[in-house]
Interface confidence: medium
C-alpha cells in the first residue's frame, strides 16, 4: 500500500523538516530558514512561533519543530502552548478581570497566581485556631478546645468566606 | 470538539475601526458567557469585555470603555467587538473566550476555552 500511495503521490516521501516543492517538479526541499514542518508530505513549511516581548523562548524553532515560549519574569503561561502571559500577583492576592486584588477578609493565598482561598475552618474537625490566618497564610488549627488547660483562650473562628465569581462592573 | 476561531484583526490608522468576530462550534452557544481580553507586546493580558449567555448582559474593562462595544449572534454562534477611536495601545492580540457559565466572572478561571488570537495594529 506504502508503495502504490508513493507511486501516486511523490510528496509523500519528502520527510518532516523538508516540503515538497511544487515549482521544482515536486522535489523534497529544505524548509527555509525560519520555518518547520513537523510531519512529512507537506506542501509548504510552516512559519516558526516568534518569542517576544513579555513571551521569552523556551525551545528554539527547528526544521521539524515549532519553537516554544515561556513567560518572563513575573508573568505566567495561559492558554494552549503558552499562548498568553498572564501577570503575577504577590502573596495575599489574587489576579481578576481587572488586576492584582488583596485577598478578602477569611480568605489567603500562599502564591503568585491563583485565587484566593477561604482559611480553613478549625471547628470543623472539633480543633481551635491556633494561629490566626493572614492574607498570605491559612489559619493552623491547634487541639480541640477541651484539650486545652484551664484558662486558655480559643481565637474566634474566622468567617466564611465570599463566593468567588461576581460579575466585574 | 469546542473551537473559538477569531478573525476580522488588522492594520488600521489611528482614530479608525475594526469589528472583530469569533465562530464558536462544539457546544451550545447561547449557554455561556463570552469574553474578549488582549496581549500587547510588552504587558501581560488584559481583560477588555464580556457578555452574558443571553447578551443582555455586557461589561468593559476601563481603558475601553465608551470605544469598544460587545455583542453577539445566538443564531451564529459569533461573538463580535466592535472597536471604534481607536489608539496605539490598543495594538494587540485580541483572544476570544469562553466561560463555565451563563453569567461572566471576576476571574479567568472562570475560563475553560480560549482561541488562537488575531493581531490588531493600530498605526499612526
Known amino acids: 500500500f506504502e508503495r502504490t500511495r508513493s507511486l501516486q503521490d511523490p510528496c509523500s516521501n519528502c520527510p518532516a523538516g523538508t516540503f515538497c516543492d511544487n515549482n521544482r517538479n515536486q522535489i523534497c526541499s529544505p524548509c527555509p530558514p525560519n520555518s518547520f514542518s513537523s510531519a512529512g508530505g507537506q506542501r509548504t513549511c510552516d512559519i516558526c512561533r516568534q518569542c517576544k516581548g513579555v513571551f521569552r523562548t523556551r525551545k528554539e524553532c527547528s526544521s521539524t519543530s515549532n519553537a516554544e515560549c515561556d513567560c518572563t519574569p513575573g508573568f505566567h503561561c495561559l492558554g494552549a502552548g503558552c499562548s498568553m502571559c498572564e501577570q503575577d500577583c504577590k502573596q495575599g492576592q489574587e489576579l481578576t478581570k481587572k488586576g492584582c486584588k488583596d485577598c478578602c477578609f477569611g480568605t489567603f493565598n500562599d502564591q503568585k497566581r491563583g485565587i484566593c482561598r477561604p482559611w480553613t475552618n478549625c471547628s470543623l474537625d472539633g480543633k481551635s485556631v491556633l494561629v490566626n490566618g493572614t492574607k498570605e497564610r491559612d489559619v493552623v488549627c491547634g487541639p480541640s478546645p477541651a484539650d486545652l488547660s484551664p484558662g486558655a483562650s480559643s481565637v474566634t473562628p474566622p468567617a466564611p468566606a465570599r463566593e468567588p465569581g461576581h460579575s466585574p462592573q | 470538539e469546542v473551537q473559538l476561531l477569531e478573525s476580522g484583526g488588522g492594520l488600521v490608522q489611528l482614530g479608525g475601526s475594526l469589528r472583530l468576530s469569533c465562530a464558536a462550534s462544539?457546544?451550545?452557544?447561547?449557554?455561556?458567557?463570552m469574553t474578549w481580553v488582549r496581549q500587547a507586546p510588552e504587558k501581560g493580558l488584559e481583560w477588555v469585555s464580556s457578555?452574558?449567555?443571553?447578551?443582555?448582559?455586557?461589561y468593559y474593562g476601563d481603558s475601553v470603555k465608551g470605544r469598544f462595544t460587545i455583542s453577539r449572534d445566538n443564531s451564529q454562534n459569533t461573538v463580535y467587538l466592535q472597536m471604534n477611536s481607536l489608539r496605539a495601545e490598543d495594538t494587540a492580540v485580541y483572544f476570544c473566550?469562553?466561560?463555565?457559565?451563563?453569567?461572566?466572572?471576576?476571574?479567568?478561571?472562570?475560563?475553560?476555552?480560549w482561541g488562537q488570537g488575531t493581531t490588531v495594529t493600530v498605526s499612526s
Open positions: 473566550a469562553k466561560e463555565k457559565a451563563g453569567t461572566t466572572g471576576d476571574y479567568y478561571y472562570n475560563v475553560d476555552v
Open positions: 457578555i452574558s449567555g443571553s447578551g443582555d448582559d455586557t
Open positions: 462544539g457546544f451550545t452557544f447561547s449557554r455561556y458567557a
